[in-house]
């Protein structure tokens, strides 16, 4: 039988690398059962993380998983730095792994790179 | 449904580089994550990495300085390069998805035979 | 990488009898809070197919007569009855740690 506990898959050390300017959807995959539990965004400031209170979230249902998604619109420069998503469930505080989000500002780039050869480039 | 589709040469030359491409239909890689895997002649399978949703992507530390996978959105199509290969590369490769619950494979492609050969 | 050590590499079972297959990690499958282990079978000629996710949860679509157990390093699938269907090589993988590895392989045959 599936067991009913609520779990978050941000992968382990998981990176994202994106353009300044463009919009992003970064996804928390929360697994539950009955009833979906309240997920919050943060980002970390050195050991504290700082709840993410007027950001536009949004859930996404797809079998078998839920993702509460923290949107960017659009990417800016101190976007940069490491979330978390954690949710709260039977009194329980479950805390996902972090993810990293590397922003790179198109201002500063002599030239503006498509999304896919930054992504290869930057993760080559 | 999801289905992937992988394509490119059955035969390339030592020190050659491979490159093959996996075309996705019923999903857009823009969501979940896309992997490549090969399965060797005496039946053991590698993982060889993957590109995710945002463009990013992870390789095994074996390959990591032989192996890239980019990525066409518009096409919905993302690809393996292999650089100097050798005979040790011969082997079925597999592109599949991996559900980002749990991060198993739910769907896979049918492979298609590499053999590097002089 | 972790290794995940499947035993026997191969089997031959009657029909209609229990095939049971192991596979041991060499590090606790946990990081999640959950076991991401997982079971695929493969065909002559096919892909693998997922049967088993996330240790004992059933993929759609695949028979009750498969199921998984297991946690931590010490991981089973469970063939019960098998019929001649299910000749195949049985493959256990784990998600739990980059980079993500696979059992050898146990290639079941009928007796």
């Known amino acids: 039988k599936e067991s009913c506990d609520v779990q978050l898959y941000i992968k382990r050390q998981s990176e994202h690398s994106i353009l300044a300017g463009d919009p992003f959807e970064l996804e928390c995959p929360v697994k539950y059962c009955a009833n979906r539990p309240h997920v919050t965004w943060c980002k970390l400031n050195g050991t504290t993380c700082v709840k993410l209170e007027d950001r536009q979230t949004s859930w996404k249902e797809e079998k078998n998983i839920s993702f509460f998604i923290l949107h960017f619109e659009p990417v800016l420069p101190n976007d940069n730095g490491s979330y978390r998503c954690s949710a709260n469930f039977q009194r329980n505080l479950i805390e996902s792994h972090s993810t990293t989000l590397y922003v790179t500002d198109v201002k500063s780039a002599s030239e503006r790179p498509s999304k896919d050869e930054m992504a290869s480039r930057f993760w080559a | 449904e999801v289905q992937l589709q992988e394509s490119g040469p059955s035969l390339v030359k030592p020190s050659q580089t491979l490159s093959l491409t996996c075309s996705v239909t019923?999903?857009?890689?823009?969501?979940?994550?896309w992997n490549w895997i090969r399965k060797f002649p005496g039946n053991k399978l590698e993982y060889m990495g993957y590109?995710?949703?945002?463009?990013?992507?992870y390789f095994n530390p074996s390959l990591k300085s032989r192996i890239s996978i980019t990525r066409n959105t518009s096409k919905n199509q993302y690809y393996l390069q292999l650089n100097s290969v050798t005979t040790e590369d011969t082997a079925t490769y597999y592109c599949?998805?991996?559900?980002?619950?749990?991060?198993?494979?739910?769907?896979w492609g049918h492979g298609t035979t590499l053999t590097v050969s002089s | 990488d972790i290794v995940l050590t499947q035993s026997p590499a191969s089997l031959a079972v009657s029909l209609g009898q229990r095939a049971t297959i192991s596979c041991r990690a060499s590090e606790t499958i946990d990081s999640y809070g959950d076991s991401l282990m997982h079971w695929y079978q493969q065909k002559a000629g096919q892909p693998p197919k997922l049967l088993i996710y996330?240790?004992?949860n059933l993929e759609s679509g695949i028979p009750a007569r498969f199921s998984g157990s297991g946690s931590r390093t010490d991981f089973t699938l469970t063939i019960n009855p098998v019929e001649a269907d299910d000749v195949a090589t049985y493959y256990c993988?784990?998600?739990?740690?980059?980079?993500?590895?696979f059992g050898g392989g146990t290639k079941l045959e009928i007796k």
């Open positions: 019923g999903d857009s890689i823009t969501s979940a994550y």
């Open positions: 590109i995710s949703y945002s463009g990013s992507t």
């Open positions: 599949a998805r991996s559900h980002y619950y749990g991060y198993y494979f739910d769907y």
């Open positions: 993988q784990q998600t739990d740690e980059d980079p993500y590895t």
């Open positions: 996330r240790a004992s």
